[in-house]
Interface confidence: low
């Protein structure tokens, strides 16, 4: 006859792992018993258990209440155990030796792995502003047994780097990801991909990116000169920008104090009736966490009237 | 152990306001952005804001722009989400989460707006 078991046993950290043992034997033979060791190399051999053809299963007192007979029905010639929550330690080789009767003993090993899948951890860089250059965007971790792989997944270009500390019976891989921040990059996702043969698909992470910038400031309004003239309403200049976190706004006058009657609206400065004294230079600030701009522009209100003078002047000298 | 408990929800008439609240522990809160994010019945999870870890930077999704406020408060390890003008379609379980990771997630608490 001959002894059937696997060279490898898988299983994944806290779950059941099943020893085969099965004795294909001849017509007519037997099996006594069945005696499980762990015999890891420069150890000697530690019992497991006992399993015999008439009283059961006889388990030593380090495996108690964690060695067992599989459910029946059961082969009479199958010599199997199932070692209840596998952990870390149990990692290592295991010798079936069948006792049968009349052919004698036979003995086969197998290796128990145990898989420790990894908890990874997402941790973000320092803050992220436009204009830096190559930096930290997040490094996630992630600890198994075997190594876990830690890749990225995202439309945001950037470089990554690993690294891997070997422990007694696990390891530690670390990826990061650089980038050169831009605000383009604002929101987009970024995400830590951790496969291992413990995990029955791939863990994902996600950390949304956050860019703090500032845009140039302009001042719209000033398009068409013309219609800044003597008593014309409605009359406005609007600071345009944009920024993360969102700006806020402020309007000055360079040559002197706003005057009275304009009024301030966050991003809008709104003028009265067109005098001559609303011609200046008006100052739109643009400021958050990140940074501040400034833009500045001359009103200049023009007077009809000397308007009309200069092209009688001209018509006449025509 | 990272725990996050939100509380604040319930019923509101539309037009109406709440304010959410999560408290932390289990980490150094004051370090990480955190955020909320909403899941309606039968559909998928989704961003509503994010906040800082000092405070300064907020983020909002465009639906509750101007409506809601997200603030926190690093010394009593809470974070807020002030929701003003509710309206029906802002009915959902609201989550409180460590934003930058995101597998740390509250049980979440219910907000219905309805008359």
């Known amino acids: 006859g001959e002894l059937e078991t696997s060279d490898v046993v898988t299983v994944v950290l806290g779950q059941d792992a099943k020893l085969p043992c099965f004795y294909r034997g001849d017509s007519g033979e037997q099996v006594g018993q069945v005696a499980w060791a762990r015999v890891d190399a420069g150890e000697g051999a530690q019992e497991l258990a006992l399993l015999h053809s008439k009283y059961g299963l006889h388990v030593s007192p380090a495996y108690e209440g964690r060695v067992e007979q599989p459910p029946p029905p059961r082969n009479p010639l199958d010599g199997s155990v199932l070692l209840r929550n596998a952990v870390q330690a149990d990692e290592g080789e295991y010798e079936c030796r069948v006792s049968t009767f009349p052919a004698g003993s036979f003995q086969a090993r197998l290796r128990l792995r145990v898989l420790v899948p990894p908890l990874p951890s997402l941790n973000p860089g320092p803050a992220l502003e436009e204009g830096q250059g190559l930096t930290l965007a997040a490094s996630c971790t992630a600890e198994g047994s075997p190594a876990p792989s830690v890749t990225w997944d995202t439309e945001v270009k950037g470089t990554t780097s690993s690294r891997s500390f070997k422990h007694s019976r696990s390891a530690a891989v670390t990826s990061e990801f650089h980038l050169v921040p831009s605000r383009s990059m604002n929101g987009q996702p970024l995400t830590c991909v951790v496969s291992h043969p413990g995990l029955l698909q791939d863990q994902r992470i996600t950390h949304i990116l956050h860019v703090s910038f500032l845009a140039e400031a302009s001042v719209r309004g000033l398009e068409d000169q013309n219609l800044w003239h003597i008593g014309r309403e409605g009359a406005m200049l609007k600071c345009l920008s944009e920024g993360q976190p969102p700006p806020s706004y402020n309007w000055t006058r360079l040559d002197g104090p706003l005057p009275s009657g304009v009024r301030v609206d966050g991003d809008t400065l709104g003028f009265p009736p067109l005098t001559t004294e609303h011609s200046g230079i008006y100052v739109c600030h643009v400021s958050n966490e990140f940074s501040s701009r400034d833009s500045q522009v001359t009103v200049d209100v023009l007077d009809p009237q000397e308007d009309s003078g200069k092209q009688v002047d001209l018509v006449s000298a025509s | 152990e990272v725990q996050l408990l939100e509380s604040g929800g319930g019923l509101v008439q539309p037009g109406g306001s709440l304010r959410l609240s999560c408290a932390a522990s289990g980490f150094a809160y004051s370090s990480y952005y955190m955020g909320w994010y909403r899941q309606a019945p039968g559909k998928e999870r989704e961003f509503v804001s994010a906040?800082?870890?000092?405070?300064?930077?907020?983020y909002y999704a465009d639906s509750v722009k101007g409506r809601f406020t997200i603030s926190r408060d690093n010394s009593k390890n809470t974070l807020y989400l002030q929701m003003n003008s509710l309206k029906p379609e802002d009915t959902a379980v609201y989550y409180c989460?460590?934003?930058?990771?995101?597998?740390?997630w509250g049980q979440g608490t219910q907000v219905t707006v309805s008359s």
């Open positions: 906040i800082s870890s000092s405070g300064g930077g907020t």
């Open positions: 989460a460590v934003e930058l990771t995101y597998n740390y």
